[in-house]
């Protein structure tokens, strides 16, 4: 979408605008993400046989992973800039708790994990500048969210490499769907 | 740990060049984001340019934004054999004069002091007319 003059547009000559446009700055954030998750992948993919498991569904039953659907208004038919911008940025709160479970599973790409979950943080805030109606987004309640961590971590090892895989699975889908609905605003 | 030590400051006449760099060490994760700021002497910390680095070859490798005042006169790039990079400064003003610091960080796309992880100590500019 266009952006109105005197927001965030490159003709305006303020003296420390942003060197990007807050489309273009949303859109390179998530594929910042998307490149850090592939790094994890790789190791997930190398340390275990988890990526070509056939037994993710019993997994799966343990996590709410955030998954987009037909009424969230992200998909082409049936699109809705609101209702899909207020989906994507809940979900990617929701994907907070789970972006935190990885801090402690990475040998050799500890920094790494941190750093997925520091970008995803800024991008969260990018995204709330861009939505108008921040009243429609509901925040994950950290009660919740501690008692899921605690239950994430004391699975059995086969079932924590399971997770890990699936959770940076559904995380690359979702920011690639967040990525083709929020191209067309 | 990661660790930045800036060298490449010093005194040049206006117009002049200088080539500032900071050598990376200690940094295992990709993508991340390094940025040079300048600060004179009272005044905050100002933004000057970014880049943008990847141990994969994505299209976001080696983007680039340069501060306004900067841009067309000075060039960041990465030499990533040396974990280095680099500030060329052209045509230098008087009002370059400054401590130049490198900053890095693993948020992404950020453009203030404040958003940035790891600092070098600085090394000092001085541009006479």
């Known amino acids: 979408a266009p952006v109105p003059p005197g927001e965030d547009s490159k003709d305006v000559a303020a003296p420390h605008r942003q060197p990007l446009t807050s489309s273009e700055r949303i859109d390179k954030q998530i594929r910042y993400i998307l490149d850090g998750i592939s790094a994890l992948r790789k190791e997930t993919c190398n340390k275990s046989n988890m990526c070509e498991s056939s037994k993710e569904a019993l997994a799966e039953n343990n996590l709410n992973l955030p998954k987009m659907a037909e009424k969230d208004g992200c998909f082409q038919s049936g699109f809705n800039e609101e209702t899909c911008l207020v989906k994507i940025i809940t979900g990617l709160l929701e994907f907070e708790v789970y972006l935190e479970y990885l801090q402690n599973r990475f040998e050799s790409s500890e920094e790494q994990a941190r750093a997925v979950q520091m970008s995803t943080k800024v991008l969260i805030q990018f995204l709330q500048k861009k939505a108008k109606n921040l009243d429609a987004i509901t925040t994950p309640d950290p009660t919740t969210n501690a008692s899921l961590l605690t239950k994430l971590q004391a699975q059995n090892q086969w079932l924590q490499d399971m997770t890990t895989h699936l959770i940076l699975r559904s995380f690359k889908e979702f920011l690639q769907s967040s990525l083709r609905a929020l191209r067309q605003m | 740990q990661v660790q930045l030590v800036e060298s490449g400051g010093g005194l040049a006449q206006a117009g002049g060049s200088l080539r500032l760099s900071c050598v990376v060490s200690?940094?295992?994760?990709?993508?991340?984001?390094i940025g040079w700021f300048s600060q004179r002497p009272g005044k905050e910390r100002e933004w000057v340019a970014t880049?943008?680095?990847?141990?994969?070859?994505?299209?976001?490798?080696?983007?680039?934004y340069y501060a306004d005042s900067v841009r067309g006169r000075f060039t960041i790039s990465r030499n990533d054999a040396k974990n280095t990079v680099s500030l060329q400064m052209n045509s230098l003003k008087p009002e370059d004069s400054a401590v130049y610091y490198c900053?890095?960080?693993?948020?992404?796309?950020?453009?203030?002091?404040?958003?940035?992880?790891?600092w070098g100590q600085g090394t000092q500019v001085t541009v006479s007319s």
């Open positions: 880049i943008i680095g990847s141990d994969r070859s994505t299209d976001l490798d080696g983007d680039t």
């Open positions: 200690g940094r295992t994760f990709s993508p991340y984001t």
């Open positions: 900053a890095l960080t693993a948020k992404g796309y950020v453009f203030t002091d404040n958003e940035y992880d790891y």
